[in-house]
C-alpha cells in the first residue's frame, strides 16, 4: 500500500455515485481520528475488489448505509 | 462536459517566481484529488505534485519540495501553483490533472481530466 | 523509488496491426496502483487503463491491459489511424508519488 507517516487521510478523492448493495463485498466506515479528521467510508466492490471512497455527505451514500444497515439488522437473530 | 483550463505560464527568469492557476467546470471540484504533471520539450512526462480533494495532504517530486506549493480554492474551482526559484529545468509544459472519482491509498483510478497545459520557460 | 522501463521505445506497426507495448518495474507494483495513458502531438495526455486492467470510460475496447508484479502488458487489438501516439505507463508508489515510464511511440511503419 502506498502509505507513508505523512499520509493523514485514505481517501485523494470522493465520489458521490450511487453504489448497488448487491455489489458490495464490504463496507468500511472509518471514524475521524487523531490522523484524519473526518469520516471516511470505503467500499470494496466484488468485482476485481476495487476499493471506492464515497462522499459520506452525498444522499446517495446516505441511502447505501442506511439500505446496508438494515440488511445487517434483517441477518443478526 | 468536464473540463480543466491553466493559466499564468510565461518566460520568466531564473530565480524568479510565477503562479499557475487551473480551473475546473462540468464536476464537483471539492470531490476530487488534483495533480500538477509537466512535460519538458520534447521529453516526457513527469507528475510534479498531487493535494487531496480537502487539501489535507499535499506531496511534490524531489526535485521541486521547498520550491514549489500546490494548493486549492474549492469556494473558486481553482486549483494552484506556487513556483519560486525557478531553474533552467523547470521549463515545460504544465498539466493540471483530475484524480479519478474514488481514489484512495488503497485503489488508484488514475488522472481521467486534463487541461491543455500552460507553458512555462525559465530564460535569461 | 519504483522505476519504470518500458518498451521498445518505438513500435513501427501498420493500421490493422496488434500492437503490444511492455512496461517494466524495478520492483513489484499492486496492480491496482498501475495505469496507462496515450499522448498524440499537441495535446495533453488522455486515460486508457487503470488497475491496470480496466478501461476508463470511452475507451473502445481494443485497448486492453494486463500484467502483474513487475510486467505489465497494453495491447491494441487492431490499429487504428488515430492510434499512433505516445504511450506511457505509471504507477502510484509509496511516499506516495505517481511515477511515469518514459513512453513508448507507436508510430506508422
Known amino acids: 500500500v502506498p502509505l507513508s507517516r505523512t499520509v493523514r487521510c485514505t481517501c485523494i478523492s470522493i465520489s458521490n455515485q450511487p453504489v448497488n448493495p448487491r455489489s458490495l463485498e464490504k463496507l468500511e466506515i472509518i471514524p475521524a481520528s487523531q490522523f484524519c479528521p473526518r469520516v471516511e467510508i470505503i467500499a470494496t466492490m466484488k468485482k476485481k475488489g476495487e476499493k471506492r471512497c464515497l462522499n459520506p455527505e452525498s444522499k446517495a451514500i446516505k441511502n447505501l448505509l442506511k439500505a446496508v444497515s438494515k440488511e445487517r439488522s434483517k441477518r443478526s437473530p | 462536459q468536464m473540463q480543466l483550463v491553466e493559466s499564468g505560464g510565461g518566460v520568466v527568469q531564473p530565480g524568479r517566481s510565477l503562479r499557475l492557476s487551473c480551473t475546473a467546470s462540468g464536476f464537483t471540484f471539492s470531490n476530487n484529488g488534483m495533480h500538477w504533471v509537466r512535460q519538458a520539450p520534447g521529453k516526457g512526462l513527469e507528475w510534479v505534485a498531487v493535494i487531496w480533494f480537502d487539501g489535507m495532504n499535499k506531496f511534490y517530486v524531489d526535485s521541486v519540495k521547498g520550491r514549489f506549493t500546490i494548493s486549492r480554492d474549492n469556494s473558486k474551482n481553482t486549483l494552484y501553483l506556487e513556483m519560486n526559484s525557478l531553474r533552467a529545468e523547470d521549463t515545460a509544459i504544465y498539466y493540471c490533472?483530475?484524480?479519478?472519482?474514488?481514489?484512495?491509498?488503497?485503489?488508484?483510478?488514475?488522472?481521467?481530466?486534463w487541461g491543455q497545459g500552460t507553458t512555462v520557460t525559465v530564460s535569461l | 523509488e519504483i522505476v519504470l522501463t518500458q518498451s521498445p521505445g518505438t513500435l513501427s506497426l501498420s493500421p490493422g496491426e496488434r500492437a503490444t507495448l511492455s512496461c517494466r518495474a524495478s520492483q513489484s507494483v499492486s496492480s491496482s496502483y498501475l495505469a496507462w495513458y496515450q499522448q498524440k502531438p499537441g495535446q495533453a495526455p488522455r486515460l486508457l487503463i487503470y488497475?491496470?486492467?480496466s478501461r476508463a470510460t470511452g475507451i473502445p475496447d481494443r485497448f486492453s491491459g494486463s500484467g502483474s508484479g513487475t510486467d505489465f502488458t497494453l495491447t491494441i487489438s487492431r490499429l487504428e489511424p488515430e492510434d499512433f501516439a505516445v504511450y506511457y505507463c505509471?504507477?502510484?508508489?509509496?511516499?506516495?508519488?505517481?511515477?511515469f515510464g518514459p513512453g513508448t511511440k507507436v508510430d506508422i511503419k
Open positions: 490533472a483530475r484524480e479519478g472519482d474514488g481514489s484512495g491509498i488503497y485503489y488508484y483510478y488514475g488522472m481521467d481530466v
Open positions: 488497475g491496470a486492467s
Open positions: 505509471q504507477q502510484y508508489g509509496s511516499s506516495p508519488i505517481f511515477t
